[in-house]
């Protein structure tokens, strides 16, 4: 913490300008009025303050706004944003996409994923839902940031907005997030023809249930292995060899290359070796011929 001293008369600050870069930390603390700083935040980013000096300015704002900064200040934080912790950001109420854009630009190239995720969360809360304008801003200024949102926040995306989401925006989404987004995408693209539908739904298929994957296998979609590998393990395991062959089409030979990676490995273990042999790929590890499969989980559920 910066020690308290009184401000020398000749150092009194009446406006935020470049002369402040020559102030020592304790002089900034003593001489800069927090209310003046807040009122002239738009000037701060143009002044080449050191990181130590920025620490003092942040401390000033923290004292003035213990419950969180107002958006008029947040919008003009500039490089001062780099000093914010997720805990600081959690106190904010942000509704303006201009504020979001400004801070996303500042954070680019810095290790600030936790701060950015919290900021986006505050924007979604502030705006009430993840609307098209917010999604467009995220895809333009922060590809992949959509996946920093919790499944609960993503549930506020209207299906009509899903079309604005690009494949690369979903690259870092986990299974729980795709579980939320997939039904919305299915709804958004339901009126499209088979091939067009598959192109659109492909990035969301990590959230698809088995019955939807089975349905795709009847539509000659020729799913690539990259997409197949992103399917939920639970969605892949019940598929038969014939269904997987139909689903992958000419890409089925890729199973050989990926046979040691999940979910391919787990799926192989559930198939009869006889059935796997029909693919002619030399896949090994299936259930030997003549073995009886007892599904004990079904028996437990009945007892």
């Amino acid at each position: 913490d910066v020690e308290r001293t009184t401000c020398p008369p000749e150092k009194e600050v009446h406006e935020i300008d470049e002369s402040l870069i020559f102030y020592k930390k304790r002089e900034l603390e003593a001489c800069v009025d927090a209310a003046l700083l807040a009122a002239q935040m738009d000037r701060v980013d143009a002044i080449p303050f050191t990181y130590e000096q920025l620490d003092v300015l942040k401390h000033k704002l923290d004292e003035l706004y213990p419950q969180g900064y107002p958006e008029s200040v947040i919008r003009h934080l500039g490089h001062l944003f780099l000093k914010m912790s997720p805990e600081d950001i959690r106190k904010w109420n942000v509704t303006s996409l201009e504020t979001l854009k400004a801070l996303l630009k500042v954070s680019k190239g810095h290790e600030m994923s936790a701060q950015v995720a919290t900021l986006i969360d505050r924007v979604v809360v502030g705006r009430g839902q993840l609307d098209k304008d917010t999604v467009d801003t995220l895809t333009a200024f922060c590809p992949g940031c959509l996946c920093s949102l919790s499944p609960e926040r993503l549930s506020s995306v209207p299906p009509s907005v899903i079309g604005a989401v690009r494949p690369q925006d979903l690259d870092t989404c986990g299974p729980r997030q795709l579980d939320v987004l997939y039904p919305k995408a299915r709804l958004a693209f339901q009126n499209m023809s088979g091939s067009e539908y598959f192109v659109k739904i492909r990035p969301f298929l990590g959230g698809a249930p088995t019955e939807d994957v089975k349905a795709l296998s009847q539509q000659n979609v020729s799913m690539d292995l990259a997409t197949f590998m992103k399917l939920r393990r639970e969605a892949v395991l019940p598929l038969t060899v014939a269904e997987v062959q139909k689903l992958l089409g000419p890409h089925v030979e890729g199973l050989k290359v990926e046979e040691q990676h999940s979910p391919v490995r787990d799926w192989i273990l559930k198939q009869r070796q006889d059935d796997l042999d029909t693919l002619g790929l030399g896949l090994q590890g299936g259930i030997p011929n003549g073995y009886l499969i007892l599904d004990l989980s079904v028996r437990e559920a009945l007892s």
């Epitope: 690369q168 590998m229 992103k230 050989k256 290359v257 990926e258 046979e259 990676h261 999940s262 030399g282």
Partner: antibody, heavy 119, light 108 residues
Framework: EVQLVQSGAEVKKPGASVKVSCKAS????????MDWVRQAPGQGLEWMGD????????IYNQKFNGRVTMTEDKSTSTVYMELSSLRSEDTAVYYC????????????WGQGTTVTVSS | EIVLTQSPATLSLSPGERATLSCSAS???????LSWYQQKPGQSPRLLIY???NLASGIPARFSGSGSGTDYTLTISSLEPEDFAVYYC?????????FGGGTKVEIK
């Protein structure tokens, strides 16, 4: 432009560990596995293993089992290869190479990272 | 593991000549799962041919590949000065993936 950019050269003592990074750009990171291949001075190429960035799943060449660990960071499109208990015969150039999931050929390679193990 | 043996170890030829490089596998390789790479001194390897005979993007048509089972061939119909390098075959038909020991094509 598709690029794989690796971390700089390393000099390590026997018994130490080395962690090499490979940052991908210009393509959908999770549509390709990342494999690691090494080349000892004046020698041929040796496959070490791969990682699926989508699932984080790994396969290692048994020759390196227990010594090699591959990890990924989807947020930065970066893959890491750590080799532990280094010995002099681990002196080599280590390459990351992109492999489209479902194929086995490497269509883009990193520039290589020289690791020297010497006491 | 499948051992890939490349022959000859060194091939001394002049520009304009035809180069034939062999790759022999210790057990059968599915032809879809064999590729060839070129490596020049101080550079990373570069994909030339995949799935035995498919030319990779940007590779000139003077390169071609053929073969099946245990025997595979890379042919350069007419050597250009930039073709003098080391060539490796590679299989992913069986785990672990393996490379051949390489054939060095040098200027005679």
């Amino acid at each position: 432009e598709v690029q794989l950019v690796q971390s700089g050269a390393e000099v390590k003592k026997p018994g130490a560990s080395v962690k090499v990074s490979c940052k991908a750009s210009g393509y959908t990171f999770t549509d390709y596995n990342m494999d690691w291949v090494r080349q000892a001075p004046g020698q041929g190429l040796e496959w070490m293993g791969d990682i699926n960035p989508s699932t984080g799943g790994t396969i290692y060449n048994q020759k390196f089992n227990g010594r090699v660990t591959m990890t990924e960071d989807k947020s930065t499109s970066t893959v890491y290869m750590e080799l532990s208990s280094l010995r002099s015969e681990d002196t080599a150039v280590y390459y990351c190479a992109r492999r489209r999931i479902g194929t086995g050929y490497f269509d883009v390679w990193g520039q290589g990272t020289t690791v020297t193990v010497s006491s | 593991e499948i051992v890939l043996t490349q022959s000859p170890a060194t091939l001394s030829l002049s520009p304009g000549e035809r180069a034939t490089l062999s790759c022999s596998a210790s057990s059968s390789v599915i032809s879809s799962y064999l590729s060839w790479y070129q490596q020049k001194p101080g550079q990373s390897p570069r994909l030339l041919i995949y799935r035995t005979s498919n030319l990779a993007s940007g590779i000139p048509a003077r390169f071609s590949g053929s073969g099946s089972g245990t025997d595979y061939t890379l042919t350069i119909s007419s050597l250009e000065p930039e073709d003098f390098a080391v060539y490796y075959c590679h299989q992913w038909s069986s785990f672990p993936y393996t490379f051949g020991g390489g054939t060095k094509v040098e200027i005679k």
